[in-house]
């Protein structure tokens, strides 16, 4: 187990002519965020294929507004690292996609809008525990500078995070054949308990007795290199003329999966889908109870208190299989409607909605009066592709949810005093004025500029404005 860390140093115009226009403007201020997607191996995979090693989304960067006439500078970046935790061994070779997203902060109805500014991709070799590797990638006229590294989480150490460290049993030195764990010099390597003969360079194990191969190696002891060149025959003996090394039988030939497991080939070797009650690389581990921790990827184990009763793994979002061992590509379902963008955050699926839409799947049209009610007796008014609420007296805000102060606008003229009232406001007029808002002077001869006041209402009495 460990963490892949990505530090973005700068994102801005690349060298050479044709500098890109600033993605933000005074009218449409914006900010950036980044998404990284990691896949094991060096395969040329489509951008849409699942991020099998994991993915991460950065925080939003500071808001940026373009200075008119100025060229687009390096844009302000989010703070902090992007971190992608990995549960299994670090594969040593990996593919990455780094996307730069723009969040527009204009006054669109329904909040901000997102658009992809740039996408860079690459394939790299990287040992865990090594120093930061620096990189520069270009996408069109944009340039992205970044560093990355993979580090192991204790107690794992080594270039693949497969060796384990344990506190020393003796104060001075480690046991026979065991080295101190750099950089944790007060700890010692735990003895490896992989299958006898498992290649120490190309194999690793996560459970006693198994031998799992790193990228590029196969065979029961991970001693057979997998060909990376293209061969005429998909299987068969190695060809001396092409220098092509291909394992003879296919990885699923003879079905290596025990206990009724079904075998499927993978780019790296094979994968067993085990029936409930069995797990392990070849479904060889049986009599499993919840105490054995059979549920992977944070799955919750239920039942199975004894070997005869079956357990059930309740998988977290993004995983499936009887042991939560399979990652689901949930964005392939295309759950986001109305042009929303699907982001698989690992633990959750998020739709980034276009302006004017909202909801878990962007199903809610904010521009549509039919899909939005105005509170407290307000009425919805459509116009120009947007909606607004015309609020009843005493209420305000986008949805008429806020209680408005009817006196805030100082509606009483000529020094009249305003009083809020459940049905509106009341003006108490200064001497010499009358009317609902004290707008009419009382004539010196006693006649007013208004029609005669209703019986019982003297000039200067409070006038209720309804």
């Amino acid at each position: 187990a460990g963490v892949f860390e990505l530090q973005i140093h700068s994102f801005g115009p690349g060298p050479g002519p044709g500098a890109p226009r600033s993605p933000c403007s005074a009218r449409l201020p914006c900010r950036l965020f980044f998404r990284v997607c990691l896949k094991p191996g060096l395969s040329e995979e489509a951008a849409e294929s699942p991020c099998a090693l994991g993915a991460a989304l950065s925080a939003r960067g500071p808001v940026y507004t373009e200075q008119p006439g100025a060229p687009a500078p390096d844009l302000p970046l989010p703070d902090g690292l992007l971190q992608v935790p990995f549960r299994d061994a670090w594969p040593g070779t990996f593919s990455f996609i780094i996307e730069t997203w723009r969040e527009e902060l204009g006054d669109q109805i329904g909040g901000p809008a997102w658009s992809l500014l740039a996408r860079v991709a690459g394939r790299r070799r990287l040992a865990a525990g090594g120093p930061w590797a620096r990189d520069i990638q270009r996408a069109g006229a944009w340039e992205l500078r970044f560093s990355y590294r993979a580090r192991c989480e204790p107690p794992a150490v080594g270039t693949a995070c497969t060796r384990l460290c344990r506190p020393r049993s003796a104060p001075s030195r480690c046991g026979p054949g065991l080295r101190p764990c750099a950089p944790l010099e007060d700890e010692c390597e735990a003895p490896l308990v992989c299958r006898a003969g498992c290649s120490p360079e190309h194999g690793f194990c996560e459970q006693p007795g198994e031998c799992r191969c790193l990228e590029g190696w196969t065979g029961p002891l991970c001693t057979v290199p997998v060909s990376t060149s293209s061969c005429l025959s998909p299987r068969g003996p190695s060809s001396a003329t092409t220098g092509c090394l291909v394992p003879g039988p296919g990885p699923c030939d003879g079905n290596p999966c025990a206990n009724g497991g079904s075998c499927s080939e993978t780019p790296r070797s094979f994968e067993c889908t085990c029936p409930r009650g069995f797990y392990g690389l070849r479904c060889e581990v049986s009599g499993v109870t919840c105490a054995d921790g059979p549920c992977f990827n944070g799955g919750l184990c239920v039942g199975g208190a004894d070997p005869d009763s079956a357990y059930i793994c309740h998988c977290p979002p993004g995983f499936q299989g009887s042991n939560c061992e399979k990652r689901v590509d949930r964005c392939s379902l295309q759950p986001c409607r109305n042009g929303g963008l699907c982001l698989d955050l690992g633990h959750a699926l998020r739709c980034r909605c276009r302006a004017g839409f909202a909801g878990p799947r962007c199903e809610h049209d904010l521009d549509d009066c039919a899909g939005r009610a105005c509170a407290n007796g307000g009425t919805c008014v459509e116009g120009g592709g947007a909606h607004r609420c015309s609020c009843a007296l005493g209420f305000g805000g986008r949805d008429c949810r806020e209680r408005a102060d009817p006196c805030a606008a100082r509606p009483c003229a000529h020094g009249g005093r305003c009083y809020a009232h459940f049905s509106g406001l009341v003006c108490a007029c200064a001497p010499g004025y009358m009317g609902a808002r004290c707008e009419f002077p009382v004539h010196p001869d006693g006649a007013s500029a208004l029609p005669a006041a209703p019986p019982g209402l003297r000039p200067g009495d409070p006038q209720r404005y309804l």
Epitope: G110, P317, C336, H347, R350, P360, R361, H364
Partner: antibody, heavy 118, light 112 residues
Framework: EVQLQQSGAELVRPGALVKLSCKAS????????IHWVKQRPELGLEWIGW????????IYDPKFQDKASITADTSSNTAYLHLSSLTSEGTAVYYC???????????WGQGTLVTVSS | DIVMSQSPSSLAVSVGEKVTMRCKSS????????????LAWYQQKPGQSPKLLIY???TRESGVPDRFTGSGSGTDFTLTISSVKAEDLAVYFC????????FGGGTKLEIK
């Protein structure tokens, strides 16, 4: 482990206001929408509305538009349901539930019983 | 608003029997772009919160026994329990998440 922990039972007078809370743990609060659902005996489940904690946007069933207000506090990973002008029809169990783009109401709180009585 | 109707409102069966309950929506829940039905089924046992069983009309939630099957498309949907167990005693609700959210009135499953 994902959990939605709701506040305790409430006994309120008719016409009063009540504020129910729903504290999320075990997941990134901002990545999920939080819904509120009302359940009265023999009357099934009624959806009140949702909030997106990332931006505070809330949408309501028009039937609850004047009665309910949903807010969220991302610093404490808590969503709130404010109910106003309560009548005897407000007596119910109120549930919060979380939803992302893939799963509908995958996780539910344990429910809060609100009793409106004079 | 989309109205959800469930039938029957209650039914009593013996352990081991097959059960079918229906849910009908007042408008189609099928989204043409992804050919998915925005419908879920929930189980609510006495004194408990509802629990998600089926989503996208036919996808079984992780950990839900395979005796539960969701089917249907458009406006007509079915939840089938192939062989009822005593622990299946509950009320079953359908819910649309195509627009706003609305639940059916529920089907109460009792064990004879």
């Amino acid at each position: 482990e994902v959990q939605l922990q709701q506040s305790g039972a409430e006994l309120v007078r008719p016409g009063a206001l009540v504020k129910l809370s729903c504290k999320a743990s075990g997941f990134n609060f901002k990545d999920y929408y939080i819904h509120w659902v009302k359940q009265r005996p023999e009357l099934g489940l009624e959806w009140i509305g949702w909030i997106d904690p990332e931006n505070g946007n809330a949408i309501y069933d028009p039937k609850f538009q004047d009665k309910a207000s949903i807010t969220a506090d991302t610093s404490s990973n808590t969503a709130y349901l404010h109910l106003s002008s309560l009548t005897s029809e407000g007596t119910a169990v109120y549930y919060c539930a979380s939803e992302d783009a893939y799963y509908p109401f995958a996780y539910w709180g344990q429910g809060t019983l609100v009793t409106v009585s004079s | 608003d989309i109205v959800m109707s469930q039938s029957p409102s209650s039914l009593a069966v013996s352990v081991g029997e097959k059960v079918t309950m229906r849910c009908k929506s007042s408008q189609s829940l099928l989204y043409s772009s992804n050919q998915k039905n925005y419908l879920a089924w929930y189980q609510q046992k006495p004194g408990q919160s509802p629990k998600l069983l089926i989503y996208w009309a036919s996808t079984r939630e992780s950990g839900v026994p395979d005796r539960f099957t969701g089917s249907g498309s458009g406006t007509d949907f079915t939840l089938t329990i192939s062989s009822v167990k005593a622990e299946d005693l509950a009320v079953y609700f359908c819910q649309q998440y195509y627009s706003y959210r609305t639940f059916g009135g529920g089907t109460k499953l009792e064990i004879k």
